[in-house]
């Protein structure tokens, strides 16, 4: 997260870190007691490596009492996402049991509604993400606030020049913005998901390249079908 | 434990090129930026570039550009500085560093005929 | 580009001294690092982010500033403390650094 602070400690019981040999790869967002939803591309930089999801995190270093990590029984990328795409960028985590619940767990209510959040809301996004354009990753969750932007003017030609989708969304990126690591993680406006972080490689913070998340709301079927 | 390893001390010829290594352990260079940066003892410290491991972009300090260019191997988390048409001028201790929090031990380049 | 000037160049400390280094900017940049290089050693970081200490980093240092003007704080001084600090700015590219302080002992 570059240009934000850091989160009021278990604030976001929604939040994940999904791991690979222990250490943070990208953000994730508890959506049901056994289900965490990422980003697809997270995958592809796993590699043979030991996927894990880490719930009940503030600080990723830190002994904290409502921290656990969780295998991954079964991991369902979209069935559309590619690797030379942001297009369907979402993955289904299984857990390997359902989590224990408490106040610093619990899923995050995901918009089933397919309509566009009104350009201007402020919409919380959080990670563990890299804080600096020097590459600095944070030891404690941050977030930031993030204005919507209208798809017609992410599309311009000085911006994402038409490759942004029905299914997703844009946010503001003039210095505040999501970054490397913290892709897969939730977009939230008015305490509900709207977004997931996509994971491309996107140059952050830069006003002229706004930041793209998945909209939740155009695969809820999908979505459904999974965790069903 | 974060460590940068970096490749031995090179004495080259005027006009010649030369490719230092740094080889990461403790974390995954995908996962962040790494720099490169120069010492030497009438310029100081001054940053060469940095790339983004996972999809090779780098930025550069325009005085670096044609003169440095940074790589990566992921598969062997390892970075390269490879400096070209050297001088008198680039004789210099040579770091890598991770995010700009770690830094390597440093190789020194000679450069003299 | 953001040109850092670092004062005194030179300075010295006694034991216990409370020291002062200062770096300034020819224009407003938003965030400072700063390192301590011993002699023969790489350079570690010591404060990101203006104020923020590095990890392993003694408390006696703090970092301060804003726009134009920074400065590192040794509350007491150390022996071990005796080492040339650089300034580093991360709001324009290139990214520069100061020309350093050379800190001694007394």
């Known amino acids: 997260i570059l240009g934000g602070r850091e989160a009021e400690a278990h604030a976001r019981p929604y939040m994940a870190s999904v791991q690979v040999n222990g250490e943070h790869l990208c953000g994730g967002v508890l959506v049901a007691e056994q289900w965490v939803l990422s980003a697809a591309h997270c995958l592809e930089d796993a590699a043979d490596g030991k996927v894990q999801v880490l719930l009940g995190a503030h600080s990723l270093s830190q002994p904290e009492p409502s921290k656990r990590l969780y295998d991954v029984l079964r991991a369902v990328p979209h069935p559309d996402s590619r690797p030379d795409t942001i297009d369907h960028d979402l993955l289904l985590l299984q857990l390997s049991e359902k989590a224990t619940l408490g106040p610093a767990v619990r899923p995050l209510p995901w918009q089933r509604v397919d309509r566009d959040v009104e350009p201007g809301t402020l919409c919380d996004v959080a990670g563990w993400g890299i804080v600096s354009h020097a590459g600095r990753r944070p030891d404690r969750l941050q977030h930031v606030l993030l204005p919507v932007l209208d798809r017609a003017t992410c599309n311009r030609r000085t911006h994402h020049d038409g490759a942004i989708t029905q299914r997703m969304m844009c946010a503001e990126s003039n210095r505040r913005d999501s970054c490397k690591g913290d892709s897969g993680g939730p977009l939230v406006c008015g305490g509900v998901l709207e977004g997931v972080v996509t994971s491309g490689s996107r140059v952050c913070g830069n006003r002229k390249k706004p930041g793209i998340y998945t909209r939740v709301a155009s695969y809820a079927a999908w979505i459904d079908s999974v965790l069903a | 434990e974060v460590q940068l390893q970096q490749s031995g001390a090179e004495l080259v010829k005027p006009g010649a090129s030369v490719r230092l290594s740094c080889t990461a352990s403790g974390f995954n260079i995908k996962h962040t930026y790494m720099h490169w940066v120069s010492q030497r003892p009438e310029r100081g410290l001054e940053w060469i570039g940095k790339?983004?491991?996972?999809?090779?972009?780098?930025k550069y300090d325009p005085k670096f550009q044609g003169k440095a260019t940074i790589t990566a191997d992921t598969s062997s988390n390892t970075v390269y500085l490879q400096l070209s048409s050297l001088t008198s001028e680039d004789t210099a201790v040579y770091y890598c560093l991770n995010a700009m929090e770690y830094w390597g031990q440093g190789t020194s380049v000679t450069v003299s005929s | 580009q953001s040109v850092l000037t670092q004062s005194p160049a030179i300075m010295s400390a006694s034991p216990g001294e409370k020291v002062t280094m200062t770096c300034s900017a020819n224009s407003s940049v938003s965030d400072m690092y700063w390192y301590q290089q011993r002699p023969g050693s790489s350079p570690r970081l010591l404060i990101y982010?203006?104020?923020n200490l590095a990890s392993g980093v003694p408390v006696r240092f703090s970092g301060s500033g804003s726009g134009t003007s920074y400065s590192l704080t040794i509350s007491r001084m150390e022996a071990e403390d005796a080492a040339t600090y650089y300034c580093q700015q991360w709001s324009t590219y290139p990214w520069t650094f100061g020309g350093g302080t050379k800190l001694e002992i007394k």
């Open positions: 790339i983004d491991p996972a999809n090779g972009n780098t």
């Open positions: 982010d203006t104020s």
